[in-house]
């Protein structure tokens, strides 16, 4: 899937009312110095790229964070102003179901949600030169 | 689909290193997450390093630091440098690609890494 075709001023709006509110309320009681983070992403389809592998996907130390508000609202987003996004989802949403379990916040997962926000605000700037 | 080919692992004494590749053919590598496992005697497979396609990279505590996971996706590889290798190291090595977004996941078959003096 490509996301080429999104409308990246809408998702935008939908990050800064109410995605953004959500990551910050999941990283709340961690200092925002805690994370060194590095993350980058050239331009708005490759951030949503890299967003939707962070997001739905798991990574060492974080199993999932597919259930968490961020990320259904996140979810959500894309298919309304993401052309055929939905249609790609069918096999992941099946396999969620299957898997139920008990929601645990790591250190991992919070790096990881951090990470989150840096594409998300590299998302925001897209005129911004690479650093 | 893509398939795996994992290569590079030996035996090594305590202290040394190693690299691991995974080769990959067929479509889809490029926007994949991928993943090296291991997999120790009478231990469940553990996920401990991850790499998403713009490269940003995670890692449990018991690899960080020493052990490197990097991509080459004009070259469809993907590497594992392991620094200061530890008896504990030891075990069966998978790579493994997963699309982000039916999180289909393809497999390796496995490389051998024994740490021992």
């Known amino acids: 899937y490509d996301f080429t075709n999104c409308d990246f001023e809408k998702i935008k709006a939908a990050y800064l009312s109410t995605i953004s509110k959500d990551l910050i309320t999941y990283m709340s009681g961690t200092k925002s110095t805690e994370f060194n983070n590095t993350v980058s992403c050239s331009n708005r389809p490759h951030c949503l790229t890299e967003i939707q592998s962070l997001t739905f996907n798991p990574t060492a130390g974080c199993a999932s964070l597919a259930k968490e508000m961020f990320a259904m609202k996140t979810k959500a987003a894309l298919a309304i102003w993401c052309p055929g996004y939905s249609e790609t989802q069918i096999n992941a949403t099946q396999a969620m179901k299957k898997r139920r379990k008990r929601k645990v916040t790591t250190n991992k997962c919070l790096e990881q949600v951090s990470q989150l926000q840096g594409l998300w605000r590299r998302f925001n700037r897209p005129l911004l030169k690479q650093q | 689909e893509v398939q795996l080919v994992e290569s590079g692992g030996g035996l090594v004494q305590p202290g040394g290193s190693l690299r691991l590749s995974c080769a990959a053919s067929?479509?889809?590598?490029?926007?994949?997450?991928l993943y090296w496992y291991r997999q120790a005697a009478g231990i469940e497979r553990e996920l401990i390093a991850s790499?998403?396609?713009?490269?940003?990279?995670n890692y449990v505590d018991s690899v960080k630091g020493r052990f490197t996971i990097s991509r080459d996706n004009s070259e469809n590889t993907m590497y594992l440098q392991m620094n200061s290798l530890r008896a504990e190291d030891t075990g069966v090595y998978y790579c493994?690609?997963?699309?982000?977004?039916?999180?289909?996941?393809?497999w390796g078959q496995g490389t051998l890494v024994t740490v021992s003096s």
């Open positions: 067929g479509s889809g590598f490029g926007v994949n997450i």
């Open positions: 493994a690609s997963r699309n982000i977004f039916d999180g289909t996941t393809e």
């Open positions: 790499i998403t396609s713009g490269g940003i990279t």
